[in-house]
Structure formats: C-alpha cells, structure tokens
C-alpha cells in the first residue's frame, strides 16, 4: 500500500481523502494517488455549474467591473477637485473592486479548464485572498459611505480638511483590518492535486483538519464582525436617512436629492440581498454542515451565492453614480462616447446663445466639477 500523510481533505464541501491505496486507471497504469475526492465532489468539479455557469458570471463581472471601476477610480483621483469623505470611500471601494476583478481572467480560465489551476500556489492564494478581501472591504466601505451620507444630512456643513483626513484614516484602518483577517487565506495551502481527475484545484479542496472546525469558526467570526455589525450600521443609517428626508421641506432640489438617496438605498439594499447576505449566510451554514455532518447539502447554493457575491463589483458603479456628480457626468459621457471637454464647450456655446436670445428653452446638464456630499 502506498503510504502518504493520512490526512483527509474537504474543499468547500468537496470531500477528498488522502489515498493509501493503489489506484489503477482505466488503462491499467498504476498511479501514486495522494488526494482523492468522492463522487459528489468529482461531479461538481467536472459539472456544468463550475465549468460553465461560474465562468459566464465571472466574465460578465470582469467585462462590466473592470472599466466601470477603473473609470471611477480615475474620476475620484484625478477629476474630483474636492476630496470629500464620500469620494475617499468610493475611491477605496473602486480600488477594492479593481484588485479583485483584475485576477478574474485567471479565475475564468481555471473554471473553463475543468477547475485546473496551472498558475502556481502563490497566485491561487492571492486570488482567494483578494476574492474574500474584496467582499469584506466592500461591506466596510459601503458602511462608511452609508453612515457618512446620513451624517451629511444631519450636519450639512461645508467640506473640511479634517473630515477628509478622518476618512483617509478610517480607509487605511479598513485596509489593515482586511489584510489581517484574510491572512489565514494567504497562509493556508490552497492548491491540491487530484490525480483521479488530473487537475490541481485552487481553494476547492482543502485539508479536513483546517475545514472541520477552523473554517466554520473563521467564517462565523467574519459573518458577525465584518458582515452583521456593518449591515446593522448601514441599515440604521438608511432608516434614519429616510426619516430625515421625509420630514424635511421639499423644494425641487431637495426632491432630486431625495430621489437619488432612495435610488442609492435601493442599490445598497440590492447589493446586500444579492451579494453579501446569501454568501455570508451560506458560508456559515455550509461549513456548519461540514463540521456537524461531514458533508454539505447546500454546496450548489453556496457556490452560486459566492459567485453572486462578485456582482458587487458591477453594482458598486451604480452607487458612485447616485452619490457623485463627477462620476455621473463621466459615466454619461463615456456611454455617449463624448469627452467632458466637448460637453463643456457645448455648454459654454449654448449658454452664450441662450443669454443673447433671452431664451430659456434649453438647459444642458451641468458638468462643473462638483460632488454631492
């Protein structure tokens, strides 16, 4: 009998075992098998859910998320004069999305090629760390943004350097926190070769020693500390914001602001319902089932939930759109294939014509550099 480290492994819910038996392939060749997965795991690793559905969703996220977040980061860094706290949080949100999305081509290739990772262990760890890091970063920056939006309604004071510095400090603290909480994902060996399928998995098969208790405790802690608590803060901020907006006097400008605030709330709510809640809930339930029963019957749901969590990179630009004038203008112009400069020239021309003819029949959307905060 071939001896190996007798450690069983389960991944996501994929159950694999160190194989101490001689394995003979259909061609009659004896292979020294180290890790072996059960039939359920084999069907998942070779099935359409992971080799067709996941790459399709990840491709959509990449195609939409990369340019929109790239443009957002560019707008917030180089096209927004006043760096309000909202701008700082959105810039960090865009950066978090970009850091996750840039690795998606590798993720897409991995799934298309039958869950076979050929890019080395280090890149796998980076991909997984950034994948979870992005989700938790998004939750925290979204919370900061939500609380800040409420704070602006309560205290509508002008921009101050102090506020911006606080926002920068909070952002740095979030990055540091996320780096710390994702350390286990970088430290754990994420790649495992499955000879029976002739593939090297990335994160899909993990040592049982790690999974049974540790992964449950890890994701439960994250779900409570980095999901539930921020979700409560976000919900509170929006509930209070709605109350404030309801009670405030309504002029045309306030009505516009109110509508945009409602759109923002709906967008963030959608993000929580689609991206954050299912993934965090199923991470806990899934690892609890593995811990208590040795198998997870919610694996397919868990996979879909984690996949949908990446859609936050596509939904975030809508948040920027409802919060930032600058991003809104650049987004409109990018979609209409116009440059901001061209629009400004058009504006100047139209304004002068309007004044000379004493006509007020046409009014172009303003593209002056201004941010709602």
């Amino acid at each position: 009998t071939i001896q190996g480290t007798n450690r069983s492994s389960k991944g996501r819910s994929l159950i694999g075992k160190v194989d101490g038996t001689s394995h003979v392939t259909g061609k009659g060749v004896t292979v020294e098998t180290v890790f072996s997965v059960d039939e359920f795991s084999a069907s998942v690793l070779t099935g359409k859910l992971t080799t067709v559905f996941l790459p399709i969703v990840y491709t959509i996220v990449f195609v939409v998320g990369l340019p929109s977040n790239g443009m957002a980061l560019w707008v917030f860094l180089f096209r927004t004069k006043k760096k309000h706290p909202a701008v700082i949080y959105m810039a960090n949100l865009a950066l978090a999305d970009l850091l996750s999305v840039i690795w998606f081509p590798l993720k897409i290739a991995y799934h298309i090629h039958g869950n076979n990772w050929i890019y080395g262990e280090a890149l796998c760890n980076v991909l997984i760390g950034f994948f979870y890091g992005n989700m938790y970063c998004s939750i925290l920056f979204m919370t900061c943004l939500s609380v800040q939006r409420y704070w602006v309604i309560v205290n509508p004071m002008g921009h101050s350097r102090k506020k911006a510095n606080i926002a920068i400090g909070i952002s740095l603290a979030i990055w540091l926190l996320i780096l710390l909480v994702t350390i286990p994902l970088y430290v754990v060996k994420q790649t495992i070769f499955i000879p029976a399928l002739n593939i090297t998995t990335c994160h899909d098969v993990l040592p049982e020693q790690l999974l049974v208790g540790d992964m449950f405790n890890y994701f439960l802690s994250l779900a409570i500390g980095v999901f539930l608590f921020p979700a409560f803060l976000t919900a509170s901020a929006y509930v209070l914001m709605i109350r404030m907006l309801r009670s405030s006097a309504m002029d045309e400008n306030s009505e516009k602001k109110r509508k945009r605030a409602i759109k923002l709330i709906v967008t963030v709510l959608a993000m929580y319902l689609i991206c954050f809640t299912p993934s965090n809930l199923l991470l806990v339930v899934h690892y609890f089932l593995i811990k208590s029963q040795g198998q997870s019957h919610v694996y397919a749901l868990y996979i879909v939930a984690l996949c949908l969590s990446t859609l936050n990179s596509c939904i975030d630009p809508f948040v920027y759109y409802f919060v930032s004038h600058d991003f809104r203008d650049h987004a409109k112009n990018a979609l209409l294939c116009r440059s901001v400069r061209t629009v400004k020239q058009m504006q100047v021309s139209l304004t002068s014509k309007k004044h000379s003819r004493k006509s007020s029949s046409y009014s172009s959307s303003s593209t002056t550099v201004k941010t709602s905060y």
């Epitope: 075992k17 070779t46 029963q293 040795g294």
Partner: antibody, heavy 121, light 107 residues
Framework: EVQLVESGGGLVQPKGSLKLSCAAS????????MHWVRQAPGRGLEWVAR??????????YYADSVKDRFTISRDDSQNMLYLQMNNLKTEDTAMYYC????????????WGQGTTLTVSS | DIVMTQSHKFMSTSVGDRVSITCKAS??????VAWHQQKPGQSPKLLIY???NRHTGVPDRFTGSGSGTDFTLTISNVQSEDLADYFC?????????FGSGTKLEIK
Amino acid sequence: EVQLVESGGGLVQPKGSLKLSCAASGFTFYSYAMHWVRQAPGRGLEWVARIRSKNVHYATYYADSVKDRFTISRDDSQNMLYLQMNNLKTEDTAMYYCVREDYYGSSYDYWGQGTTLTVSS
Amino acid sequence: DIVMTQSHKFMSTSVGDRVSITCKASQDVRSAVAWHQQKPGQSPKLLIYWASNRHTGVPDRFTGSGSGTDFTLTISNVQSEDLADYFCQQYSSYPFTFGSGTKLEIK
C-alpha cells in the same frame, strides 16, 4: 429502496477463477463508487476493491492481498458490479459483500446480503 | 493503513440497560468514523456516520460520539433485537478500515 443482490459464489479449487456479480437497484447506480468487502468465517471485515464512477474515469483500487489477482468492473447500463477473481487462494474463502459508498464519501451506506466463496481442494 | 481497535470482543448487557462500545484509531481520523451493526446471519447495516449522525431509520437509542482517535457507540435502553456484532470503521483515508468487532450479548 436501495437494493444490492450478489450472486456467483461457490466452491472453487485453489488457483481457480470465479466471477461475482452484484445487481443494484433503487438508486442512480452510475453516480456512485462501489466496493467489494469480504468477511472470512469468524473474522472481521476486510475491504477488497473499489471502482469509481464515470466522472472519475472508472478508476479502480485494490487491497494489497488481492492486487494483480482480482479485477473489479461495472456495467452502468445494466446496473451491475463485478469482481473477477483469478489464482484463488484458500485465504480468499469468505462472504463477499457488494457495498455502496456514500455519495459524499462518508462510509459505506448500503450493503448487499453477500455471496459465499469457498476455496478448497 | 489506519488500524481501528475495538478492545472488547464481547460485551454482556440486559434489556433496558445502557451499554457503550469503544473504538480507538491508530491516528487522528477527525470525525470520519462510522458504526455498522451485523445481526446473526445477516449483512452489516450502517448505524452511525460522521461519528455522531444516525443513518436513515436508525432508532434514536443509538448514539455515537468522539473525535480524533477515541470513539464510542452508546445504546441506551438495550432491546433484545440489538443482539449483534458492532463494527467501527474509519473513512478518513483510503483504504477504509474496520475494527475487529464487538459482540453484544443479551443476558
């Protein structure tokens, strides 16, 4: 209801050959890994061989004691599992059980009623 | 291969009593242990998997416990039909291996 029915056992002389069969019903046979486990008279249970599903290219595994003498195979279209035994030894005398491995790799969840092999001159 | 040791070959008990059958693994198998029951003249049947989970249709007087290397099958309120051999089995790594069995006798 899951049912596994073994057949083909009997009396064989040492160095002889015999093929055991197992008819499976009540589940999607092609999805599961299947095993042969034996129990010699008055002794414990001993794993003999394992065959995987099509997903894993029907990979086969054997205990050291039967390697190169026994061959496990399956016919998914007929829901049948087989064990071809060659160069039989007296120590192969046992009750042979056809066993289903749980879909999640958690133990053996269903056993057949067994078929007896006696190797004697 | 992992060796599963059932120290008691025989255990004697009375109807209505509570009995505990133990099993020790030669190395850490986490919770990947099953218990099988084999009544006289019958084939084995799965009772417990993943150390403590009852298989479909198994009466709740059968409970499993333990993790790592030490495992216990407890039968509370023993019934006459519980007269059988009880085998532990590890499935932490291939090949799956069995304990030598404990025969439960009813006084």
